[in-house]
Protein backbone atom coordinates (compact mmCIF):
# COMPACT_ATOMS: atom_id res chain seq x y z
CA UNK A 1 0.00 0.00 0.00
CA UNK A 2 1.00 3.64 -0.56
CA UNK A 3 0.70 6.33 2.06
CA UNK A 4 0.56 10.05 1.43
CA UNK A 5 2.71 12.02 3.81
CA UNK A 6 1.36 15.56 4.24
CA UNK A 7 4.14 18.12 4.30
CA UNK A 8 3.85 21.73 5.45
CA UNK A 9 6.17 24.54 6.46
CA UNK A 10 6.59 24.88 10.23
CA UNK A 11 8.30 27.62 12.23
CA UNK A 12 9.94 26.73 15.54
CA UNK A 13 11.55 29.00 18.09
CA UNK A 14 14.77 27.60 19.47
CA UNK A 15 16.16 28.36 22.92
CA UNK A 16 18.48 31.00 21.30
CA UNK A 17 15.48 32.83 19.87
CA UNK A 18 16.26 32.30 16.15
CA UNK A 19 13.54 31.06 13.82
CA UNK A 20 14.08 27.85 11.88
CA UNK A 21 11.95 27.11 8.82
CA UNK A 22 11.47 23.63 7.46
CA UNK A 23 11.85 23.24 3.66
CA UNK A 24 8.67 23.88 1.75
CA UNK A 25 7.24 21.14 -0.41
CA UNK A 26 4.81 21.63 -3.30
CA UNK A 27 1.60 20.30 -1.75
CA UNK A 28 0.10 19.69 -5.20
CA UNK A 29 2.66 16.90 -5.62
CA UNK A 30 1.95 14.50 -2.73
CA UNK A 31 4.94 12.59 -1.41
CA UNK A 32 4.26 8.88 -1.37
CA UNK A 33 6.29 6.17 0.20
CA UNK A 34 6.13 2.41 0.04
CA UNK A 35 5.28 0.77 3.33
CA UNK A 36 6.69 -2.63 4.13
CA UNK A 37 4.30 -3.97 6.74
CA UNK A 38 5.41 -1.73 9.58
CA UNK A 39 4.15 1.71 8.61
CA UNK A 40 7.63 2.99 7.67
CA UNK A 41 9.09 1.63 10.88
CA UNK A 42 6.60 3.75 12.79
CA UNK A 43 6.57 0.93 15.37
CA UNK A 44 9.78 0.98 17.37
CA UNK A 45 11.46 -1.60 19.56
CA UNK A 46 10.39 -4.61 17.52
CA UNK A 47 6.71 -3.68 17.39
CA UNK A 48 4.73 -4.31 14.21
CA UNK A 49 1.94 -2.51 12.41
CA UNK A 50 -1.26 -4.58 12.23
CA UNK A 51 -2.98 -2.27 9.79
CA UNK A 52 -4.55 -0.12 12.49
CA UNK A 53 -1.99 0.33 15.22
CA UNK A 54 1.35 -0.79 16.53
CA UNK A 55 1.40 -4.12 18.29
CA UNK A 56 4.15 -3.71 20.86
CA UNK A 57 6.41 -6.32 22.39
CA UNK A 58 6.96 -6.51 26.15
CA UNK A 59 8.02 -4.25 27.87
CA UNK A 60 6.96 -1.49 25.43
CA UNK A 61 3.71 0.37 24.82
CA UNK A 62 2.46 3.59 23.24
CA UNK A 63 1.52 4.70 19.74
CA UNK A 64 4.99 3.87 18.45
CA UNK A 65 6.03 1.40 21.14
CA UNK A 66 8.46 4.00 22.43
CA UNK A 67 7.41 3.93 26.08
CA UNK A 68 8.31 1.35 28.70
CA UNK A 69 5.57 -0.15 30.87
CA UNK A 70 5.75 0.26 34.64
CA UNK A 71 4.83 -3.35 35.36
CA UNK A 72 5.11 -6.63 33.47
CA UNK A 73 2.68 -9.52 33.89
CA UNK A 74 4.39 -12.55 35.31
CA UNK A 75 2.29 -15.60 35.97
CA UNK A 76 3.67 -18.11 38.44
CA UNK A 77 2.02 -21.53 38.23
CA UNK A 78 -0.96 -22.01 40.54
CA UNK A 79 0.63 -25.16 41.91
CA UNK A 80 4.16 -26.50 42.03
CA UNK A 81 5.18 -30.12 42.35
CA UNK A 82 7.92 -32.54 43.24
CA UNK A 83 8.51 -36.08 42.05
CA UNK A 84 10.47 -38.56 44.14
CA UNK A 85 11.79 -41.72 42.52
CA UNK A 86 11.76 -44.47 45.15
CA UNK A 87 12.41 -48.19 45.30
CA UNK A 88 10.94 -50.51 47.92
CA UNK A 89 11.00 -54.29 48.15
CA UNK A 90 7.67 -56.00 48.90
CA UNK A 91 8.17 -59.40 50.53
CA UNK A 92 4.51 -60.37 51.06
CA UNK A 93 3.94 -61.03 47.36
CA UNK A 94 5.83 -63.57 45.26
CA UNK A 95 7.02 -62.22 41.92
CA UNK A 96 5.48 -63.65 38.75
CA UNK A 97 6.13 -62.61 35.15
CA UNK A 98 2.55 -61.32 34.82
CA UNK A 99 3.48 -58.42 37.10
CA UNK A 100 5.65 -56.98 34.33
CA UNK A 101 2.57 -56.50 32.16
CA UNK A 102 0.82 -53.30 33.28
CA UNK A 103 -2.50 -54.37 31.76
CA UNK A 104 -2.60 -57.75 33.51
CA UNK A 105 -5.00 -58.66 36.31
CA UNK A 106 -1.98 -59.27 38.57
CA UNK A 107 -0.44 -55.85 37.97
CA UNK A 108 -3.77 -54.06 38.44
CA UNK A 109 -4.34 -55.81 41.76
CA UNK A 110 -0.78 -55.18 42.96
CA UNK A 111 -1.06 -51.53 41.95
CA UNK A 112 -4.34 -51.14 43.86
CA UNK A 113 -2.97 -52.69 47.06
CA UNK A 114 0.37 -50.86 46.84
CA UNK A 115 -1.41 -47.53 46.25
CA UNK A 116 -3.72 -48.19 49.21
CA UNK A 117 -0.70 -49.02 51.40
CA UNK A 118 1.20 -45.89 50.36
CA UNK A 119 -1.87 -43.71 50.85
CA UNK A 120 -1.94 -44.94 54.45
CA UNK A 121 1.82 -44.36 54.89
CA UNK A 122 1.72 -40.78 53.56
CA UNK A 123 -1.74 -39.82 54.85
CA UNK A 124 -0.36 -37.07 57.13
CA UNK A 125 1.46 -35.20 54.35
CA UNK A 126 -0.76 -32.43 52.90
CA UNK A 127 1.43 -32.16 49.78
CA UNK A 128 1.04 -35.88 48.95
CA UNK A 129 -0.88 -36.55 45.72
CA UNK A 130 -0.26 -40.22 45.04
CA UNK A 131 2.11 -42.90 43.80
CA UNK A 132 2.82 -44.19 40.33
CA UNK A 133 4.50 -47.57 39.81
CA UNK A 134 7.04 -47.35 37.00
CA UNK A 135 8.47 -50.88 37.14
CA UNK A 136 8.13 -54.18 39.01
CA UNK A 137 10.94 -56.70 39.05
CA UNK A 138 12.01 -59.92 40.70
CA UNK A 139 13.34 -59.95 44.22
CA UNK A 140 10.59 -60.64 45.92
CA UNK A 141 8.84 -57.74 44.21
CA UNK A 142 11.10 -54.74 43.75
CA UNK A 143 8.79 -51.76 43.23
CA UNK A 144 10.22 -48.78 41.38
CA UNK A 145 7.75 -45.94 41.80
CA UNK A 146 7.26 -42.18 41.91
CA UNK A 147 5.82 -40.35 44.87
CA UNK A 148 4.05 -37.21 43.65
CA UNK A 149 3.85 -34.08 45.79
CA UNK A 150 2.04 -30.83 45.04
CA UNK A 151 1.50 -27.51 46.83
CA UNK A 152 0.11 -24.06 46.08
CA UNK A 153 2.70 -21.64 44.73
CA UNK A 154 4.06 -19.30 47.39
CA UNK A 155 7.47 -17.60 47.57
CA UNK A 156 8.50 -20.38 50.00
CA UNK A 157 7.30 -23.29 47.83
CA UNK A 158 10.77 -24.89 47.62
CA UNK A 159 11.04 -25.09 51.40
CA UNK A 160 7.54 -26.59 51.62
CA UNK A 161 8.36 -29.26 49.03
CA UNK A 162 11.81 -29.95 50.51
CA UNK A 163 10.19 -30.49 53.91
CA UNK A 164 7.58 -32.79 52.38
CA UNK A 165 10.25 -34.92 50.68
CA UNK A 166 12.02 -35.31 54.03
CA UNK A 167 8.79 -36.50 55.67
CA UNK A 168 8.25 -38.97 52.80
CA UNK A 169 11.73 -40.40 53.44
CA UNK A 170 11.04 -40.71 57.17
CA UNK A 171 7.64 -42.37 56.68
CA UNK A 172 8.76 -44.89 54.04
CA UNK A 173 11.80 -45.80 56.16
CA UNK A 174 9.54 -46.31 59.20
CA UNK A 175 6.95 -48.50 57.44
CA UNK A 176 9.56 -50.65 55.68
CA UNK A 177 11.29 -51.20 59.02
CA UNK A 178 8.11 -52.03 60.95
CA UNK A 179 6.03 -53.99 58.42
CA UNK A 180 8.22 -57.04 57.98
CA UNK A 181 7.56 -60.75 57.61
CA UNK A 182 7.38 -62.86 60.78
CA UNK A 183 7.67 -66.65 60.46
CA UNK A 184 7.45 -66.28 56.69
CA UNK A 185 4.12 -64.48 56.95
CA UNK A 186 2.87 -60.92 56.87
CA UNK A 187 0.18 -59.63 59.20
CA UNK A 188 0.04 -56.17 57.57
CA UNK A 189 -1.50 -55.09 54.29
CA UNK A 190 2.00 -55.38 52.79
CA UNK A 191 5.40 -56.33 54.17
CA UNK A 192 8.79 -55.04 53.11
CA UNK A 193 12.50 -55.77 53.13
CA UNK A 194 14.04 -53.03 55.29
CA UNK A 195 17.26 -52.91 53.25
CA UNK A 196 15.44 -52.52 49.93
CA UNK A 197 14.27 -48.93 50.48
CA UNK A 198 16.07 -46.33 48.38
CA UNK A 199 15.45 -42.78 47.21
CA UNK A 200 16.79 -42.60 43.67
CA UNK A 201 16.07 -39.04 42.64
CA UNK A 202 14.04 -35.95 43.58
CA UNK A 203 12.81 -33.45 40.97
CA UNK A 204 11.23 -30.18 42.12
CA UNK A 205 9.41 -27.68 39.88
CA UNK A 206 11.72 -24.80 39.05
CA UNK A 207 10.02 -21.43 38.95
CA UNK A 208 11.86 -18.20 39.59
CA UNK A 209 9.76 -15.02 39.29
CA UNK A 210 12.92 -12.88 39.32
CA UNK A 211 14.24 -14.75 36.30
CA UNK A 212 10.93 -14.41 34.43
CA UNK A 213 10.82 -10.71 35.29
CA UNK A 214 14.38 -10.12 34.06
CA UNK A 215 13.77 -12.04 30.84
CA UNK A 216 10.60 -10.11 30.01
CA UNK A 217 12.18 -6.75 30.87
CA UNK A 218 14.89 -7.41 28.23
CA UNK A 219 17.37 -4.51 28.13
CA UNK A 220 15.68 -3.00 31.19
CA UNK A 221 16.36 -6.15 33.24
CA UNK A 222 18.60 -4.29 35.70
CA UNK A 223 15.82 -1.86 36.57
CA UNK A 224 12.83 -4.18 36.95
CA UNK A 225 12.46 -6.06 40.20
CA UNK A 226 10.06 -8.44 41.90
CA UNK A 227 7.98 -7.42 44.89
CA UNK A 228 5.33 -9.53 46.61
CA UNK A 229 1.82 -8.58 47.52
CA UNK A 230 -0.46 -11.23 49.12
CA UNK A 231 2.12 -13.91 48.28
CA UNK A 232 1.87 -12.99 44.58
CA UNK A 233 4.97 -11.73 42.74
CA UNK A 234 4.83 -8.50 40.77
CA UNK A 235 7.43 -7.51 38.19
CA UNK A 236 7.70 -3.73 38.49
CA UNK A 237 9.89 -0.80 37.54
CA UNK A 238 10.45 2.00 40.06
CA UNK A 239 7.85 3.98 38.07
CA UNK A 240 5.07 1.69 39.33
CA UNK A 241 3.48 3.32 42.35
CA UNK A 242 2.46 1.64 45.58
CA UNK A 243 5.47 -0.62 46.13
CA UNK A 244 8.51 -0.38 48.40
CA UNK A 245 10.77 0.25 45.41
CA UNK A 246 8.50 2.90 43.87
CA UNK A 247 10.22 6.14 42.95
CA UNK A 248 8.54 9.30 44.24
CA UNK A 249 8.73 11.94 41.56
CA UNK A 250 6.82 14.54 43.59
CA UNK A 251 6.14 17.31 41.03
CA UNK A 252 7.00 15.23 38.01
CA UNK A 253 6.41 12.11 35.99
CA UNK A 254 8.48 8.94 36.31
CA UNK A 255 9.83 7.63 33.03
CA UNK A 256 12.00 4.63 32.24
CA UNK A 257 15.09 5.04 30.13
CA UNK A 258 17.95 2.68 29.37
CA UNK A 259 19.77 4.22 32.32
CA UNK A 260 16.92 3.46 34.71
CA UNK A 261 14.02 5.40 36.11
CA UNK A 262 14.17 9.17 36.02
CA UNK A 263 11.81 11.97 36.93
CA UNK A 264 10.59 14.41 34.27
CA UNK A 265 9.77 17.55 36.23
CA UNK A 266 6.78 19.71 35.44
CA UNK A 267 6.52 23.44 35.12
CA UNK A 268 3.44 25.08 36.53
CA UNK A 269 2.17 28.64 36.15
CA UNK A 270 3.99 29.56 39.34
CA UNK A 271 6.94 27.15 39.66
CA UNK A 272 9.72 25.39 37.88
CA UNK A 273 10.58 22.05 39.47
CA UNK A 274 13.96 20.41 39.36
CA UNK A 275 16.15 17.90 41.17
CA UNK A 276 16.42 14.16 40.85
CA UNK A 277 13.01 13.70 42.49
CA UNK A 278 11.45 16.99 41.25
CA UNK A 279 11.21 18.17 44.83
CA UNK A 280 13.03 21.46 44.34
CA UNK A 281 10.58 24.19 43.46
CA UNK A 282 11.61 27.56 42.11
CA UNK A 283 9.00 30.31 42.09
CA UNK A 284 8.86 32.00 38.73
CA UNK A 285 8.56 35.58 40.02
CA UNK A 286 10.94 35.24 42.99
CA UNK A 287 14.09 33.19 42.52
CA UNK A 288 14.19 31.33 45.82
CA UNK A 289 13.81 27.62 46.50
CA UNK A 290 11.17 25.74 48.40
CA UNK A 291 12.13 22.31 49.69
Amino acid sequence: PLATIPVSTTSLTSSEGSTISTPSVDISTPVTTSIVGDQCSRCKNGGFWDGLKCQCLTPYYGESCEEVVNSIDIAPPETVSAQMELTVTVTSVKFTDELKNHSSQEFREFNKTFTEQMNIVYSGIPEYVGVNITNLRLGSVVVEHDVLLRTKYTPEYKTALDNATEVVKQKITKVTTEQIMTNDNCSALMCFNTTGTQVQNITVTQYDPVEECRQKAEEYEDYFLVEYRDQKPYCISPCESGFNASKNCNHGKCQMSQNGARCLCVTTETHWYSGEDCNQGTQKSHHHHHH
Epitope: T91, S92, V93, K94, T96, E98, S104, Q105, E106, E109, F110, K112, T113, M181, D184, N185, C186, S187, A188, L189, M190, C191
Partner: nanobody, 124 residues
Framework: DVQLVESGGGVVQPGGSLRLSCAAS????????MAWFRQAPGKEREVVAF????????YYADSVKGRFTISHDNAKNTLYLQMNSLRAEDTAVYYC?????????????????WGQGTMVTVSS
Amino acid sequence: DVQLVESGGGVVQPGGSLRLSCAASGYTSNRYSMAWFRQAPGKEREVVAFIWTDGGRTYYADSVKGRFTISHDNAKNTLYLQMNSLRAEDTAVYYCAASSLLLQTINPRAWPYWGQGTMVTVSS
Protein backbone atom coordinates in the same frame (compact mmCIF):
# COMPACT_ATOMS: atom_id res chain seq x y z
CA ASP B 1 -13.96 -59.88 37.76
CA VAL B 2 -13.31 -62.79 40.11
CA GLN B 3 -16.43 -64.41 41.63
CA LEU B 4 -16.41 -66.77 44.64
CA VAL B 5 -19.28 -68.98 45.80
CA GLU B 6 -19.00 -71.00 49.04
CA SER B 7 -21.00 -74.05 50.09
CA GLY B 8 -20.90 -76.88 52.64
CA GLY B 9 -21.64 -75.09 55.89
CA GLY B 10 -24.00 -76.46 58.49
CA VAL B 11 -24.49 -77.67 62.06
CA VAL B 12 -22.18 -80.40 63.36
CA GLN B 13 -21.47 -81.98 66.75
CA PRO B 14 -18.11 -81.45 68.50
CA GLY B 15 -15.56 -83.93 67.14
CA GLY B 16 -17.44 -84.13 63.83
CA SER B 17 -16.32 -83.20 60.28
CA LEU B 18 -17.40 -80.86 57.48
CA ARG B 19 -16.06 -80.05 54.03
CA LEU B 20 -16.41 -76.53 52.68
CA SER B 21 -16.15 -75.75 48.95
CA CYS B 22 -15.51 -72.49 47.10
CA ALA B 23 -15.99 -72.27 43.34
CA ALA B 24 -13.92 -69.53 41.66
CA SER B 25 -14.47 -67.94 38.27
CA GLY B 26 -13.03 -64.96 36.37
CA TYR B 27 -9.32 -65.73 36.66
CA THR B 28 -7.05 -65.07 33.69
CA SER B 29 -4.21 -67.19 35.09
CA ASN B 30 -4.03 -70.63 36.73
CA ARG B 31 -1.64 -69.36 39.39
CA TYR B 32 -3.18 -67.37 42.22
CA SER B 33 -3.87 -67.45 45.98
CA MET B 34 -6.96 -68.65 47.79
CA ALA B 35 -7.76 -68.59 51.49
CA TRP B 36 -10.28 -69.42 54.13
CA PHE B 37 -11.05 -66.82 56.77
CA ARG B 38 -13.56 -67.02 59.57
CA GLN B 39 -15.41 -64.55 61.75
CA ALA B 40 -17.02 -65.52 65.03
CA PRO B 41 -19.74 -63.27 66.49
CA GLY B 42 -18.20 -60.14 68.03
CA LYS B 43 -14.70 -61.03 66.84
CA GLU B 44 -12.42 -59.85 64.04
CA ARG B 45 -12.08 -61.79 60.82
CA GLU B 46 -9.08 -64.15 61.02
CA VAL B 47 -7.21 -66.37 58.62
CA VAL B 48 -7.75 -70.13 58.82
CA ALA B 49 -5.53 -71.26 55.94
CA PHE B 50 -4.32 -70.19 52.51
CA ILE B 51 -2.87 -71.92 49.47
CA TRP B 52 -1.13 -71.00 46.22
CA THR B 53 -2.84 -72.77 43.34
CA ASP B 54 0.53 -73.66 41.80
CA GLY B 55 1.19 -75.76 44.92
CA GLY B 56 4.03 -73.53 46.02
CA ARG B 57 2.71 -72.64 49.46
CA THR B 58 0.16 -73.56 52.12
CA TYR B 59 -0.35 -71.91 55.47
CA TYR B 60 -2.42 -72.84 58.53
CA ALA B 61 -3.30 -70.85 61.62
CA ASP B 62 -1.93 -72.48 64.76
CA SER B 63 -5.46 -73.10 66.09
CA VAL B 64 -6.37 -75.42 63.17
CA LYS B 65 -3.04 -77.13 62.43
CA GLY B 66 -3.43 -80.93 62.26
CA ARG B 67 -7.26 -80.71 62.14
CA PHE B 68 -8.02 -78.75 58.96
CA THR B 69 -6.71 -79.35 55.41
CA ILE B 70 -6.82 -76.80 52.57
CA SER B 71 -6.69 -78.03 48.97
CA HIS B 72 -7.38 -76.78 45.48
CA ASP B 73 -8.60 -78.58 42.36
CA ASN B 74 -7.10 -76.74 39.37
CA ALA B 75 -9.36 -78.51 36.87
CA LYS B 76 -12.51 -77.43 38.71
CA ASN B 77 -11.14 -74.07 39.97
CA THR B 78 -12.47 -75.02 43.38
CA LEU B 79 -11.01 -74.51 46.84
CA TYR B 80 -11.77 -76.93 49.68
CA LEU B 81 -11.44 -76.92 53.45
CA GLN B 82 -11.66 -80.31 55.12
CA MET B 83 -12.46 -79.71 58.79
CA ASN B 84 -12.02 -82.60 61.25
CA SER B 85 -12.20 -82.82 65.06
CA LEU B 86 -14.40 -79.74 65.14
CA ARG B 87 -14.70 -77.78 68.39
CA ALA B 88 -17.22 -75.28 69.72
CA GLU B 89 -14.66 -72.49 69.20
CA ASP B 90 -14.66 -73.26 65.44
CA THR B 91 -18.19 -71.87 65.23
CA ALA B 92 -18.11 -68.91 62.81
CA VAL B 93 -19.00 -67.66 59.36
CA TYR B 94 -16.36 -69.07 56.99
CA TYR B 95 -15.34 -66.91 54.05
CA CYS B 96 -13.49 -67.85 50.91
CA ALA B 97 -11.02 -65.16 49.74
CA ALA B 98 -8.84 -64.89 46.66
CA SER B 99 -6.12 -62.82 45.05
CA SER B 100 -4.60 -62.93 41.59
CA LEU B 101 -1.23 -62.47 43.34
CA LEU B 102 0.78 -65.10 45.19
CA LEU B 103 0.15 -63.57 48.62
CA GLN B 104 1.97 -64.34 51.85
CA THR B 105 -0.19 -62.18 54.07
CA ILE B 106 -2.77 -63.18 56.66
CA ASN B 107 -4.26 -59.68 56.79
CA PRO B 108 -7.80 -59.84 55.32
CA ARG B 109 -7.40 -56.32 53.83
CA ALA B 110 -4.77 -57.65 51.43
CA TRP B 111 -7.28 -60.07 49.87
CA PRO B 112 -9.46 -58.28 47.31
CA TYR B 113 -12.03 -60.93 46.38
CA TRP B 114 -14.52 -62.46 48.82
CA GLY B 115 -17.38 -64.89 48.87
CA GLN B 116 -20.61 -64.25 50.72
CA GLY B 117 -19.72 -66.64 53.59
CA THR B 118 -21.12 -69.92 54.88
CA MET B 119 -22.11 -70.59 58.50
CA VAL B 120 -20.48 -73.40 60.49
CA THR B 121 -22.01 -74.19 63.89
CA VAL B 122 -20.38 -76.73 66.20
CA SER B 123 -22.84 -77.59 68.92
CA SER B 124 -24.02 -80.59 70.86
